[in-house]
Interface confidence: medium
């Protein structure tokens, strides 16, 4: 409640997160023209990426382009990219939609289509749909520990969300354990009224709101966080221009004295931790 006699000041905060969990991934792997079932384990180092600010990312799905090398190849025949002669291909031209620089030659992409040859990471990335269901759909069971230190400099008061009495094996629950700072990712989505399995396919952005409403008067002291969750990206993926949340990164290696890479288009959930609130004291 608003105590008008109190001097209020906004919270200053720092956040640190730690994600835990293991995912088993089964996917189709093609080697030498033979497609078989591949099996791999993903741990924290495989699916999380350090982000700036109060955010962390968990990869839930991916599309790989393996064995890419910097050379010449036909560009992917997306709409409007096909050619029938060299006249259509402009030497040195770099189309923003393309993955490379045109050499000026029109070359076969496959038996039926020709596209402009490019100097690029080849073979160029195909325009593939994100796998459905998501490859790391079991990320729903991962947990994240959120450490939140707060400070009210005007009142010379510092505290944190983790208390010495807290049990390291607890899991946040709105009713049974609202002060536990270990959150199951699936529960965050449930609390926000979202379907984790669905969002995991294309990715998305989820907000974790930590609200500190602190009464710092000694006779009625209270300063504990309240957690709430809401989705921050546009959930109407059909209508939005670029649905979900994804980015590309690469793993580099050498083979036959040539640098190669595996390009990974990673889809996943970016969790933004939004800390706000006030501290009031007479």
């Amino acid at each position: 409640s608003d105590k008008l006699y109190q001097r209020k000041e906004p919270v200053i905060s720092s956040v640190h997160t730690k994600v835990k969990g293991i995912a088993e991934v089964t996917e189709n792997v093609t080697e030498g023209g033979v497609t078989k079932l591949g099996h791999s384990i993903f741990d924290t180092a495989d699916y999380t990426f350090p982000l700036q600010g109060n955010s962390f990312f968990v990869m839930t799905n991916y599309v790989k382009s393996e064995g890419q090398v910097q050379t010449l190849c036909p560009e992917y025949p997306r709409r409007g990219a096909q050619c029938s002669s060299d006249r259509r291909c402009k030497k040195g031209w770099m189309d923003p939609q393309s993955k490379g620089i045109q050499t000026g030659r029109c070359v076969p992409y496959d038996k039926t289509r020709k596209t402009c040859e490019v100097s690029a990471w080849c073979p160029t990335e195909e325009e593939k749909e994100a796998p459905r269901p998501a490859l790391l759909r079991s990320a729903e069971n991962f947990t994240v520990l959120i450490k939140n230190n707060i400070h009210f400099p005007g009142h010379n008061y510092t505290t944190r969300n983790i208390l010495p009495t807290m049990n390291g094996s607890c899991t946040f629950h709105k009713t049974w354990d609202p002060q536990c700072s270990i959150f199951r990712l699936g529960d965050i989505f449930q609390e926000a009224g979202e379907n984790f399995t669905e969002v995991a396919v294309q990715g998305g952005i989820m907000g974790i709101e930590i609200y500190w409403d602190c009464n710092l008067d000694s006779w009625s002291h209270h300063c504990r966080p309240r957690y709430s969750f809401r989705r921050l990206d546009d959930k109407n993926t059909d209508e939005s221009f670029v649905p979900g949340y994804n980015f590309r990164y690469a793993k580099y290696y050498k083979e036959n004295n040539v640098e190669k890479r595996t390009l990974i288009k990673a889809f996943g959930i970016r969790f933004d931790i939004l800390v706000f609130g006030t501290g009031g004291k007479f």
């Epitope: 910097q70 050379t71 010449l72 050499t103 000026g104 030659r105 100097s119 036959n256 190669k260």
Partner: nanobody, 120 residues
């Protein structure tokens, strides 16, 4: 100046084998496609086999299963292993490379050729 020097040609009996080599020297940004073409007397030059910088190979239908192309990027060399040779394989074999030059596009380079004769 870029130079391509072929070696390994010669006279061989039908069913025999030969291994052609082509060494590339000179200053280049990078070598992209490397390959072998051949020209029999009175005929046009035709593709035998190519290998990309990513080690993707492509063969003419007439040599599939008999010829194998490979490259060694550290030595700037392309090889052609020819097995089960037939009289129809008799030709001058030319080494070819594509090299991409920043700002100038693709340059095509050819060797002088090495003679392969298959005869009993």
């Amino acid at each position: 100046e870029v130079q391509l020097v072929e070696s390994g040609g010669g006279l061989v009996q039908p069913g025999g084998s030969l291994r052609l080599s082509c060494v590339v020297s000179g200053s280049m940004y990078r070598i992209d496609n490397m390959g072998w073409y051949r020209q029999a007397p009175g005929k046009q030059r035709e593709l035998v086999a190519t290998v990309t910088r990513g080690d993707i190979t492509n063969y003419a239908d007439s040599v599939k299963g008999r010829f194998t192309i490979g490259r060694d990027n550290a030595k700037n060399t392309v090889y052609l292993q020819m097995n089960s040779l037939k009289p129809a394989d008799t030709a001058v074999y030319y080494c070819n490379i594509d090299s991409y030059i920043i700002g100038a596009g693709v340059r095509d380079y050819w060797g002088r050729g090495t003679q392969v004769t298959v005869s009993s």
